[in-house]
């Protein structure tokens, strides 16, 4: 079982390999001096059906270095950074792990791209192994919230508060149900 030629990369190089490319072979990508690698640099030849070989992920890309690029602090609820620190410049990567009792969906690493956004995939998410729900939020005096149901709310959902005419909302307008089963903030109040 073997893999076909690894996907090419513009403005970069692929590590040496011999053919046929055996299952288990790793090839590594790197970029020319003025370019930055975005994505996983190592691809692995695997087989999913014990018949054909395939590369385990897409090739990374080489972006022309933008010295002005900088990315915001990436936040993964239920997770924490195991690699990477601010400031985040073009080509820098951040790797996440999930807290105990959370499992990861998506790719654990992201890269700061020339467009100041993390990529090439979305930030991973950490999902509770024991699906927790947030308790019902109370109604507030002289105001109301979007969730009229009295039951608990699933993580990832949010509740928006608003005040009646003539009243000012003090506190958070939108409160998110976190994967920990806790609300992101206490309910606001409506004051005259």
């Amino acid at each position: 079982i073997s893999c076909g030629s690894p996907p090419p990369i513009l403005n970069g190089r692929i590590s040496y390999y011999s053919t046929p490319i055996a299952v288990g072979t790793v090839i590594r990508y790197s970029c020319s001096g003025t370019f930055r690698l975005i994505g996983e640099k190592s691809l692995l030849c695997i087989t999913k059906d014990k018949v054909d070989g395939t590369w385990d992920k897409p090739a990374p890309k080489c972006e022309y270095f933008n010295k002005y690029s900088s990315c915001p602090e990436p936040i993964v609820p239920g997770g924490y950074k195991i690699r990477g620190s601010t400031p985040y410049r073009h080509g820098d990567s951040v790797t996440f792990a999930c807290k105990t009792n959370f499992s990861m969906n998506g790719n654990k690493s992201v890269w700061c791209q020339a467009n100041n956004m993390w990529g090439p995939t979305r930030l991973p998410t950490c999902v509770s192994v024991f699906p927790l729900e947030c308790p019902a939020l109370p109604m507030i005096h002289n105001g109301h919230h979007t969730s009229e149901n009295v039951g608990s709310i699933a993580p990832g959902l949010s509740v928006t508060y608003s005040c009646e005419s003539g009243y000012l909302l003090v506190g958070e307008k939108i409160i998110n149900c976190l994967s920990s089963g806790k609300w992101s903030a206490v309910p606001p109040t409506c004051e005259e």
Partner: antibody, heavy 119, light 106 residues
């Protein structure tokens, strides 16, 4: 940090086989590759082969092809290296070493297992 | 197999001085090179990877440089605990190690 604990020293006769184990604790066994590296007395390090436990894929250095078998038991987070048709030149300390994902370099090493081949 | 050659085989340096160890690859390996330290009776310990990135917990006096076929490990001010054998390892095409450089007290 991942801890790798290897089985104890072995004395073997020429022509026989030896099986060394390497138990990992900490981290996720499925997220890394385990290599076996040996070191003959007073000599340098020699890569023998490696396995990616989650895939069950093992690859071997040409020199050891056909004589070494590397396996892994995901349920016990243990990797094994079996070397057959032993000869005196196989007397060495055998190390297991871990690379995170498929990084290529070894963050963690076992304590080593001395295998002595003598008649 | 990519052949890795280290020089010198033995290097004698006084504590507090600078030590420079060399590693040459038989073909270009980009920056896919790691350095390890090994003391008698112990397993190797990762110092540097990707030619110049220090591993977690490695003191700043250790630095790596180079790309392609020529690489250097520099220890800026030798401490007593730095006297050991140092190995380079390539991971451009499978894996192979240099024969080692023994760093001894002058």
């Amino acid at each position: 940090q991942v801890q790798l604990v290897q089985s104890g020293a072995e004395v073997k006769k020429p022509g026989s086989s030896v099986k060394v184990s390497c138990k990992a604790s900490g981290g996720t066994f499925s997220s890394y590759a385990i290599s076996w590296v040996r070191q003959a007395p007073g000599q340098g390090l020699e890569w023998m082969g490696r396995i990616i436990p989650i895939l069950g894929i093992a690859n071997y250095a040409q020199k050891f092809q056909g004589r070494v078998t590397i396996t892994a038991d995901k349920s016990t987070s243990t990797a094994y290296m079996e070397l057959s048709s032993l000869r005196s030149e196989d007397t060495a300390v055998y190390y297991c070493a871990r690379e995170e994902d498929i990084s290529g370099y070894y963050q963690d090493w076992g304590q080593g297992t001395l295998v002595t081949v003598s008649s | 197999e990519i052949v890795m050659t280290q020089s010198p085989a033995t290097l004698s340096v006084s504590p507090g001085e600078r030590a420079t160890l060399s590693c040459r690859a038989g073909q270009s390996i980009s920056r896919y090179l790691a350095w390890y330290q090994q003391k008698p009776g112990q397993a190797p310990r990762l110092l540097i990877y990707d030619a110049s990135t220090r591993a977690t917990g490695i003191p700043a006096r250790f630095s790596g440089s180079g790309s392609g076929t020529e690489f250097t490990l520099t220890i800026s001010s030798l401490q007593s605990e730095d006297f050991a054998v140092y190995y380079c390892q390539q991971y451009e095409y499978w894996y192979s190690f240099g024969q080692g450089t023994k760093l001894e007290i002058k």
